[in-house]
Structure formats: C-alpha cells, structure tokens
Amino acid sequence: QIDLNITCRFAGVFHVEKNGRYSISRTEAADLCKAFNSTLPTMAQMEKALSIGFETCRYGFIEGHVVIPRIHPNSICAANNTGVYILTSNTSQYDTYCFNASAPPEEDCTSVTDLPNAFDGPITITIVNRDGTRYVQKGEYRTNPEDIYPSNPTDDDVSSGSSSERSSTSGGYIFYTFSTVHPIPDEDSPWITDSTDRIPATTLMSTSATATETATKRQETWDWFSWLFLPSESKNHLHTTTQMAGTSSNTISAGWEPNEENEDERDRHLSFSGSGIDDDEDFISSTISTTPRAFDHTKQNQDWTQWNPSHSNPEVLLQTTTRMTDVDRNGTTAYEGNWNPEAHPPLIHHEHHEEEETPHSTSTIQATPSSTTEETATQKEQWFGNRWHEGYRQTPKEDSHSTTGTAAASAHTSHPMQGRTTPSPEDSSWTDFFNPISHPMGRGHQAGRRMDMDSSHSITLQPTANPNTGLVEDLDRTGPLSMTTQQSNSQSFSTSHEGLEEDKDHPTTSTLTSSNRNDVTGGRRDPNHSEGSTTLLEGYTSHYPHTKESRTFIPVTSAKTGSFGVTAVTVGDSNSNVNRSLSGDQDTFHPSGGSHTTHGSESDGHSHGSQEGGANTTSGPIRTPQIPE
C-alpha cells in the first residue's frame, strides 16, 4: 500500500509525501507527478508558489534539485534560510513537489480524489489530502523497476542535484533567499506566517469518512492538529501544539492562528506540505516536546505565527515527547533576527539536508471519526494549500480553541516509535538533532522528526463538541480550518509546520492527515526498526492570546478505549501564546543551536552561505530517536 500525502496547490505547486517518510527517488518523483497529471516544478515555478505562501519543511524533488521552500526562517527547516532552499548534496530519497499547470493561480485546497494518470496495478494507493480526506484506488504509477522493487529501499535516492549549484562557501549551501517582510513580528503573533491571511476554520471535525461504494474512500480527519499548528494568522488557533507520536506523512497545512495576537501567521500559507518529514523544521509534529519550550518569540515575531498556535505564549508548554523543533518556525525572535526583509532571492542551496530537513518524527494523530459522516469542522474544505493559510480566520471566540477535542491515543500511543526506522544518511538521533554542531539545521530531523506509529499506536483525535478545536490558522485566513484525521489504522497525522502556516487569506478546511507511517523519527524509517516509544501527549498548555486563556491539555485515558483524551483546563492567561516555536517557520528554536544565515548579494538573488550554527554533518544513520524531554 502506498499513501500519498499531498498539500494544497500553490500556483499549481504541491508537495507529495509517500508513506510518511522520505521515500521517493528522483525517477519515482517524475512518475508520481505524471500520475497526478503534473510535472516536477521548475525552480521558477517553485519560487512563484513560494511567493503566494507555499512553504514546507520537507526536502522534495523539483526539476534538477532537491529543495525546501521556506518563507519564514526556522532553525529546523532549511537551516533557518528562507526562499527556495536547495540541497546540494542529495544522496537519498526525498519527498517530491509537483506542478499542475491547470491549478488555480493562488491556493487550491480542493481535494484531489485520484491519480488521474495512474495505470492498472495491484497497489492500493491512498491519496491523503490536507483536509484529511482520503481517496483509495488500485493502480500503479511507477515505471522504474528499482522504484517498485528497491534493492535499498531505505536510502536509495536517485535524486540528483547539480553539483554546480553548490556554494563555494563552506557548508555547501547556496541560498537563494528572498527578503522577507518585516522581520519583527508582533509579540502577539510569534506564529505568524506571512504567507497566509486566511482565517482558519475553528471547528475540528471528526471525520469518520465513510467509504463510498467505490474503492475511493474519503475520510476527513480533524483539522484539529492543523489547527494546533497553525500560525496566528488564522483567527482560529489551535494552540495545542502537541504532536502525536505517530508521525504521519501528512503535514497540517491549515494555518492555525493561535490567537488574534498571533499576527502574521494567518497571512502565511501554511503550506505544510507533506507530513513534515522534513527536518522537523516545518513540522509541528516533531515540534512537540515534553518539556516546555520557552518561547520568547511571542513578542519578537508576531509576524510569524504560523505554526505556533499560541506562539506568543512562551509559557505554553508542549508536553508531547516529540520534538518541537519545527514549532518555532515562525518564532518571532527568529522572525526578527532571521528575517531579513531584504534577504536574498529565494534560492537556497543546502549541502546537507540531513541536518535540517531530515524527517523528524512528525506527530501523527489519528482521529477517530465521531461519526461515520465526514464532517468538516466549520472550516471550509478548501485547503489553502500547504498551510491552511488562506486563513480561516477564527474569531476570538474560536480562538478559545475548542481544544476540548480529545485526542485519543490508542494504548499503544506510548510507543509511537515502535515503527521501524532505517537509519539513513539523513537520519540522526534526537540527541544529534539538538547538537548544533552536528546538525546546525536541526539534525535529528529524520530520526526525531517522525515517530513511527503502528496503527495501534496512532493517536486518534476524537473531535469534541467544540467546533473551534480544529482551527488552523492561515495568515490571511480567519476561519478555522477543520482538521481531519485519518482513520486508517496505520494512518496518523503528521503536522508540518510548513503546512501549518496560517493563511487567513484562504479559508480552507485543513486537516492533518497522514499516511501510514512507520517512522516516528525522521528520515526514512526502516519499517523493521523499532524506535523507542514515547508518550505522545503528555499534556500541553496552549495559550489563546486573543482569548487570553491558557489551556492545559491533559492526556486522559478513556476507560472504554484506553485512548488518550485531551482535557482542556482553561487558565486565565493574558495573551499567552502557545510556543511560537511550534511554528515550523519560526527559527527561534534552533536545535542546532545556531541560526543559519543566508549570505548573498541581493543583486543576483543568490546568496552563498554556510550554516553558522555548526558544521554540517551528514553523519549518518544514527537514528537513535531519542526524544529530548
């Protein structure tokens, strides 16, 4: 079975993640895009997509390169660089980006229901949309035998990257960055993402997608997670930034708006492409850590609230054991410090993707539909693409974040990492991830980014009555995005910060859905490799600045289901925002301990730079996913 997690289309460009991990070769990438009646994007097309809010924290193929589109600096995404970050040494499998010329000019979050150009085959292919809807079909799209019967499934990477693009500078990065908007966001919106103005839909929807008579099943999952991860741009804030252990390949593309205070998030499109396999950089899924992360970004990067549901509240602690590295994508501090309004053109070459974008355990949340009907929270189903950013604006009331939605984690949830992971050159242990030297970019992406979850391990979120629960913020979008979780047994949601950027501008219903992921730790995970288990939700406090509430989510085990529920305890808290670091775009939290700055002349739009945070290491497959507490 193949699960393809796809994001909204931004100017035709979208991100595809296969099976919740970096597992696509260059040849397969071309075949996959072709199956979607698309092509690999050119650099120009990717740059344009980025201009309307597309960003992810996952390495993916485009024509001639492996890149990560970044709008907001995030220490764990593209080494804090912005623009189209190019991985110059790509020697393994990645996700892919595709370009559909017939897509709408801005964000298109309508559900993709099938692989139009797939041919007959025995493979069960599940297309998982951002909103959590799932469509299943039998077929095949791969033409290269090596992709179908890989000799080295884990690290095979046919990806190519012209060495000519490597920067002569140390670090081997070529940064083609673009200047960002005002780098200093308001305190209120650390999560803010410029890419989204859409107001996220506020309600979480529990979807129990009912399978249609045909093989195609559509399942909407709650946008709850995406809501959790959306930047403040979207009115609705999902302040819970907890990551579910099982990382799903899907990234939460809905922008969350932690609070109205989280300002720019919604403007940013949370184009969380993919499941956040990236280096955790853009994904919230990996961003949740059991230890509270002090986010000082609240005041600094209000402009960037995309992934941090309550970015402005440093107090908010994500207690999930998974990493929070991505969470700060939009951290305000990073926003101020890292964003250079006059940054360089959006082309960034990153020599070692493993450092930054290696998949980290992304949170995978499996939502159990409360009913068989697919319900989309009040959010519009249209995803604004990867970010939910079109921003369903969530009203302050919505910002109360109906976090009442319970996240039920199966009893196995405690073992999100049981999924086997195969160390890949990109992979590194969580420990390494935090080692600035080894991975300035947040090296444990792969190892730590995704938590492998068996279906039994996947956490299911059960939508609560509170419609606001599933809010996802978009920078522009004010409406809440409903997040739909996938119900597939093994499927879990992974939230990508990237996708979480809020896009208030584009109301869309976003749901975090993930394809089945065995890997909790980033990188490609060997299904046979069992990772240590971690408690997915240990409880987290989400702050809803606009409601001035701080909600503490306490995992509750359901006597009936044994699954965890999340209980929200509202604590009066003035304008506290969930950790901004939740925003994948926020740089503030730089696991590597150093921000990667982009250096370059504005004139040519290219900057060459090395990660200053530490030496880039491609050290390999040390994937011991040790989730830092």
Partner: antibody, heavy 119, light 107 residues
Framework: QVQLVQSGAEVKKPGESLKISCKGS????????IGWVRQMPGKGLEWMGI????????RYSPSFQGQVTISADKSISTAYLQWSSLKASDTAMYYC????????????WGQGTLVTVSS | SELTQDPAVSVALGQTVRITCQGD??????ASWYQQKPGQAPLLVIY???IRPSGIPDRFSGSSSGNTASLTITGAQAEDEADYYC???????????FGGGTKLTVL
C-alpha cells in the same frame, strides 16, 4: 533595504499614453508580487492589479481590467503601469507596493507617482 | 467597496480607539491595516491576526471577529492622526480589496 522607487509626477492630456514605473531594490524582485494602487484626490485606496515579475503573471481588479496594463521587466527590476489613452478621471496618485509572500498584504510601498490628466 | 469603514473617528489623546472594517470576506481572511498620513504613502501597521511589522508601536493591535476586523490604538498619540485603511482579499481570494478608509483625529 527594500525600496520601491517610482517615477516622477506626470502631467498629461486626455487621450495621451503614459507608462509609469516602479523599481524595486534590496530584495529579489522576481520573487515578490508587485501591486498597483490608485488613490484619487481626497479618496481612498483602490487596488488595480498585481504582477509577478518572475513570469509576468498578472491579475487585474475587475474595475481596471482593460483600462490599464501592468507589466514588468525583471532584468531591471522594474514594474510598470501604463495607459494607452488617458482620461481626466485617471488623475490620481498611483502607488506600487510589494506583496507579502502569501497573503494579499503589502509590506513596502513606493512613494507614489502623481498623474495629472488635464486638457 | 467590499470592505466598509467608518469615515471618521476621533479619540482623545492617550485614550483608546477602535477602527473597524466590515466585509463578508473578513470571515475568511484577515485584514491588514495601513496608516496614511497626508502626502505620504500608506504604511503597513497590522496584518494577519495581529502582527505588527517592525517599527510599529505596540499600541497598535488588530483583531477580528465574524465579518469585522478591528484596529485598536491603545493610548493614541498625536502622531497617530492619519487615515487608516483596511484591506483583505475579496471573496474569491484572488483579488485585493481596500476599505474606504477612516480618518482618525486625535483630540
């Protein structure tokens, strides 16, 4: 630093053509959309259209479609707004502004070009 | 205009004032706010949910509820006297719309 510098004021007669410019600097010009906004004397802001210099993708406000032409020359990081036949009602201050990545917000603005059309 | 603003609002020096912007598209998109002083180009002061660009005083804040976006100036200063415009996407999401503007007078 990011700057949008517009061409100087213009005084034209009805029926004449005109092309005003907006030169961007301090950032990757081809990577950001540039919008044009009109402000008639004593009035509010009106969005006219927007262009992506990278590929010249252009969108117009329904109110200005067919009335003006927006273009760009990425080689010189300049966007243009032109009229083939000016009318007195075109008298206004015209601003170019850079769109934020993603949302339709404008973070940097040019100083404005005053166009006066009078017989 | 798809976005409606009160033509004029006044506030006493040091007091708090709220300028509103209404429009159906605001249910889906956040508004941004611009300050324009006589003879000057507009200046972005708030965007997204409540984001202030660098250099914008923290007395400016934004909020949104339903179809209404609000710009609040807490402790208005004389230099805040200006015209304020809101903008957002139109209902299609592909175009930009501006409100008619609100002239703020600081007494």
């Amino acid at each position: 630093q990011v700057q949008l510098v517009q061409s100087g004021a213009e005084v034209k007669k009805p029926g004449e053509s005109l092309k005003i410019s907006c030169k961007g600097s301090g950032y990757s010009f081809t990577s950001y959309w540039i919008g044009w906004v009109r402000q008639m004397p004593g009035k509010g802001l009106e969005w006219m259209g927007i262009i992506y210099p990278g590929d010249s993708d252009t969108r117009y406000s329904p109110s200005f479609q067919g009335q003006v032409t927006i273009s760009a020359d990425k080689s010189i990081s300049t966007a243009y707004l032109q009229w083939s036949s000016l009318k007195a009602s075109d008298t206004a201050m015209y601003y170019c502004a850079r769109r934020l990545h993603g949302p339709f917000y404008f973070d940097y603005w040019g100083q404005g070009t005053l166009v006066t059309v009078s017989s | 205009s798809e976005l409606t603003q009160d033509p004029a609002v006044s506030v006493a020096l040091g007091q708090t004032v709220r300028i509103t912007c209404q429009g159906d598209s605001l249910r889906s998109y956040y508004a941004s706010w611009y300050q324009q002083k006589p003879g000057q180009a507009p200046l972005l002061v708030i965007y997204g949910k409540n984001i202030r660009p660098s250099g914008i005083p923290d007395r400016f804040s934004g909020s949104s509820s339903g179809n209404t976006a609000s710009l609040t100036i807490t402790g208005a200063q004389a230099e805040d006297e200006a015209d304020y415009y809101c903008n957002s996407r139109d209902s299609s999401g592909n175009h930009v719309v501006f409100g008619g503007g609100t002239k703020l007078t600081v007494l």
